[in-house]
């Protein structure tokens, strides 16, 4: 269905192979992406509420999908505050003591149990802040048509910010 | 090729501590996520710990029963992982498996065996 | 956490013949983001490390002959064996990936008959 205008393979924006996106779209992207849609030439991703397309040969194109894949994208995606960039060790990063793993949340019921069970957060490096300020999460659903419904994937968790006293995101695990 | 290449194992006391490292070549090590694995002999496979890339800022997962005991850190510049293992118990005695998750799959290492015993 | 399944325990099937590993999750390994099921399967023989043979439920390592399919979604998925060898003989183990913590199947040890 590409070309269409309701179908997944629509395109709110289209990259052109000859001029890439610069690192500063290219973080909005991690950001916001939501899901992919292989199509026929080029791939599909899906944000919060709008759509860029790029060629499937292309190397961001490919990272991407390679990001969202990996859950290192999306709602997953913590990112790094730009003026922070120097804090971040070239050295392994010590990292404070994790008090655990995260896990993904499907249902508001869940979204609660965690929220009450909760101790589990992810360890930042020190400095590393949490730049994603979204606080609350759609339950994962399919990509209609549309395309604009919203995929909270693996690990939506993850990022989810904690207050402001609390720095770096927060991983929370589901009642099982 | 991929390789993973721990080290770092031993026999150790219990209290005592270890830190295993993990070499990586053969894909690219600063885009994958990286994790240690563990398994006891005869037993069945125990995740432990986990590190994310450096867009997310290196966060760090660890088991509940490794938490506030292990360390899991990366140095993307050296394409190599550290588990760092503080107050080892006897229960943590177990062959120790680095492994990249990349879009291309999961690869693990050979392991290196930790042994905590008096 | 996740809880992974896996059954039988045991299995003995004769040369030739076709083996079926079953793994069922205790939640939905199927990422609506990009469509794909974050389960792998192992194999694991004496004093080796896991050896990847499936990923994203159905996609076969580089060098994992063809034999051995991986199938399902959501939370049902098999492994198959479609003509066993002699060198197939191991533990098998399925995974799932979807969250964290990674979570394993408690193995299926294949033997000979």
């Known amino acids: 269905n590409e070309g269409s205008v309701t179908g997944s393979c629509y395109c709110g924006k289209r990259i052109s192979s000859d001029s890439p996106p610069s690192v500063q779209f290219m973080n909005r992207l991690r950001k916001h992406l939501r899901a992919y849609h292989r199509c026929l030439y080029y791939t599909r991703f899906q944000l919060l509420s709008w759509s860029v397309c790029g060629g499937n040969k292309d190397p961001w194109v490919q990272e991407l999908m390679s990001c969202l894949d990996l859950k290192e994208c999306g709602h997953a995606y913590s990112g790094i505050v730009a003026h922070q960039k120097h804090l971040l060790p070239t050295s392994p990063p010590i990292s404070q003591a994790s008090e655990g793993a995260s896990s993904d949340i499907h249902t508001p019921a869940q979204m609660l149990l965690s929220t009450l069970q909760s101790t589990q957060r992810p360890t930042l490096p020190v400095g590393s802040l949490s730049s994603d300020k979204e606080l609350t999460r759609p339950n994962e659903t399919t990509i209609h048509t549309a395309g604009h419904s919203l995929a909270a994937g693996p690990e939506a968790g993850e990022n989810q910010k904690q207050p402001e006293k609390n720095a770096g995101p927060t991983a929370r695990t589901s009642a099982t | 090729e991929v390789q993973l290449v721990e080290s770092g194992g031993g026999l150790v006391q219990p209290g005592g501590s270890l830190k295993l490292s993990c070499a990586a070549s053969g894909f690219t090590f600063s885009n994958a996520v990286m994790n240690w694995v563990r398994q006891a002999s005869g037993k069945g496979l125990e995740w432990v710990a986990r590190?994310?890339?450096?867009?997310?800022?290196?966060?760090?997962f660890y088991a509940d029963s490794v938490k506030g005991r292990f360390t899991f850190s990366r140095d993307d510049s050296k394409n190599t992982a550290y588990l760092q293992m503080n107050s080892l118990k006897t229960e943590d005695t177990a062959m120790y498996y680095c492994?990249?998750?990349?879009?291309?799959?999961?690869?693990w290492g050979q392991g290196t065996l930790v042994t905590v015993s008096s | 956490d996740i809880v992974m399944t896996q059954s039988p325990s045991s299995l003995a099937v004769s040369a030739g013949e076709r083996a079926t590993i079953n793994c069922k999750s205790s939640?939905?390994?199927?990422?609506?983001?990009?469509?794909?099921?974050?389960l792998a399967w192992y194999q694991q023989k004496p004093g080796q490390s896991p050896k990847l043979l499936i990923y994203?439920?159905?996609t076969r390592q580089s060098g994992v002959p063809d034999r051995f399919i991986g199938s399902g979604s959501g939370t049902d998925f098999t492994l198959t064996i479609s003509s066993l060898q002699a060198e197939d003989v191991a533990i098998y183990y399925c995974?799932?990936?979807?969250?964290?913590?990674?979570?394993f199947g408690g193995g299926t040890k294949l033997e000979l008959k």
């Open positions: 590190i994310r890339t450096k867009p997310n800022n290196y966060a760090t």
């Open positions: 995974q799932q990936y979807y969250d964290t913590p990674w979570t």
């Open positions: 994203w439920a159905s």
């Open positions: 939640q939905s390994l199927l990422y609506s983001g990009n469509q794909k099921n974050y």
């Open positions: 492994t990249a998750w990349t879009t291309e799959g999961i690869y």
